[in-house]
Interface confidence: medium
């Protein structure tokens, strides 16, 4: 079943997807599409990279991370309820039927009527734990602050509720990751 990610109407949604290039600059083509991954390619493509660069994108879809290092996580800007659904991240590894396919379910919730105080401040101010990313060469470890124990699924859900979350790079373990080569 698909991993589920949440965001509120009007916020930016974050759908994680990663791979590790075999060598620096050896980019693997990736496509993002709306709808579950078909047998080949992506249906309803919203963004595409190739061996060189991002070669196609539509207005509200972009990559915030360093896609040249394999962070191909999708950001969807200013989401509406219509953005709910399954998204396909397809890492198009050369060779027959070598592609890695990840289906991610995005659930959009109506915006809260009463705005809460900035959760980003609350979240970053409260966290005694360390998060270590994997699959990207040397591990990156960052102290985030101080909050009681919380699992990565919860962290991922919180992260999706943060507009333009600066914590996204520290949440890679909750997303799809594949090592190439």
């Amino acid at each position: 079943s698909e991993v589920e990610y949440r965001a509120e109407v009007g916020q930016n949604a974050y759908l994680p997807c990663f791979y590790t290039p075999a060598a620096p600059g050896n980019l693997v083509p990736v496509c993002w599409g709306k709808g579950a991954c078909p047998v080949f390619e992506c249906g309803n493509v919203v963004l595409r990279t190739d061996e060189r660069d991002v070669n196609y994108w539509t207005s509200r879809y972009w990559l915030n991370g360093d896609f040249r290092k394999g962070d191909v996580s999708l950001t969807i800007e200013n989401v509406t309820l219509a953005d709910s659904g399954i998204y396909c991240c397809r890492i198009q590894i050369p060779g027959i039927m070598n592609d890695e396919k990840f289906n991610l379910k995005l659930v959009i919730k109506p915006a809260k009527v009463t705005p809460a105080p900035t959760r980003q401040r609350d979240f970053t101010a409260a966290f005694p734990r360390m998060l270590t990313t994997r699959g990207h060469g040397p591990a990156e470890t960052q102290t985030l602050g101080s909050l009681p124990d919380i699992n990565l699924t919860q962290i991922s859900t919180l992260a999706n509720e943060l507009r333009d979350s600066r914590l996204a790079n520290d949440l890679r373990d909750s997303g799809a990751t594949i090592r190439i080569g």
Partner: antibody, heavy 122, light 108 residues
Framework: QVQLQQWGAGLLKPSETLSLTCAVS????????WSWIRQTPGKGLEWMAE???????DYNPSLKSRVTISVDTSKNQFSLNLTSVTAADTAVYFC????????????????WGQGTLVTVSS | SSELTQDPAVSVALGQTVRITCQGD??????ASWYQQKPGQAPVLVIY???NRPSGIPDRFSGSSSGNTASLTITGAQAEDEADYYC???????????FGGGTKLTVL
């Protein structure tokens, strides 16, 4: 439709400071990088600096010592200061939206201000 | 070098096809964007990414890329296409924006 409206002094003396401001309307301000680009008479375009709503900046290395870019998110505005101007800084200055939203995303400039001619003369 | 190099001037007969090129080391890793600028006006984005046109740009404009060279092709050039054309991309380090020197297109 996104619109960029720019203004600032058009005539300066050598050694003075050039100051320009660009106001953005009709679209998201926080989602983008915003740049200043200049065009000297009869010559090409030269990118000068960029900034996003968080205040993250990048500068053309050849101008970095003299250029400051700043942002006022409450007004959806960003500004350029260029110190110690000379006649070589006489140019049309444009503000523009870079549709590169992420640090590593491609950088086409899809919306531009009308341009401000700045003349440096004693 | 982080610079992008363009031919200063190119001409084309009305209705014919013309290709404007942009060369630079960084174009091996980054796609160029292309802008059209007419006298007294701000530049207008005509091609971005591999070969994408913003809305309102006629389909006679197309982009391509090979090695360290990006190309803008106008198929069936019209009188209103007479303008200066600029390419831009990142520099080789990926850290800064760079523009080509521009190509003046004359439609004969």
């Amino acid at each position: 439709q996104v619109q960029l409206q720019q203004w600032g002094a058009g005539l300066l003396k050598p050694s003075e400071t050039l100051s320009l401001t660009c106001a953005v309307s009709g679209g998201s301000f926080s989602g983008y990088y915003w740049s200043w680009i200049r065009q000297t008479p009869g010559k090409g375009l030269e990118w000068m600096a960029e900034i996003n709503h968080s205040g993250d900046t990048d500068y053309n290395p050849s101008l970095k010592s003299r250029v400051t870019i700043s942002v006022d998110t409450s007004k959806n505005q960003f500004s350029l200061n260029l110190t110690s101007v000379t006649a070589a800084d006489t140019a049309v200055y444009f503000c523009a939206r870079g549709s590169r939203r992420g640090r590593y995303f491609p950088q086409p400039f899809d919306f531009w201000g009308q341009g401000t001619l700045v003349t440096v003369s004693s | 070098s982080s610079e992008l190099t363009q031919d200063p001037a190119v001409s084309v007969a009305l209705g014919q096809t013309v290709r404007i090129t942009c060369q630079g080391d960084s174009l091996r890793s980054y796609y160029a964007s292309w802008y059209q600028q007419k006298p007294g006006q701000a530049p207008v984005l005509v091609i971005y990414g591999k070969n994408n046109r913003p809305s309102g740009i006629p389909d006679r404009f197309s982009g391509s890329s090979s090695g360290n060279t990006a190309s803008l092709t106008i198929t069936g050039a019209q009188a209103e296409d007479e303008a200066d054309y600029y390419c831009n991309s990142r520099d080789s380090s990926g850290n800064h924006v760079v523009f080509g020197g521009g190509t003046k297109l004359t439609v004969l």
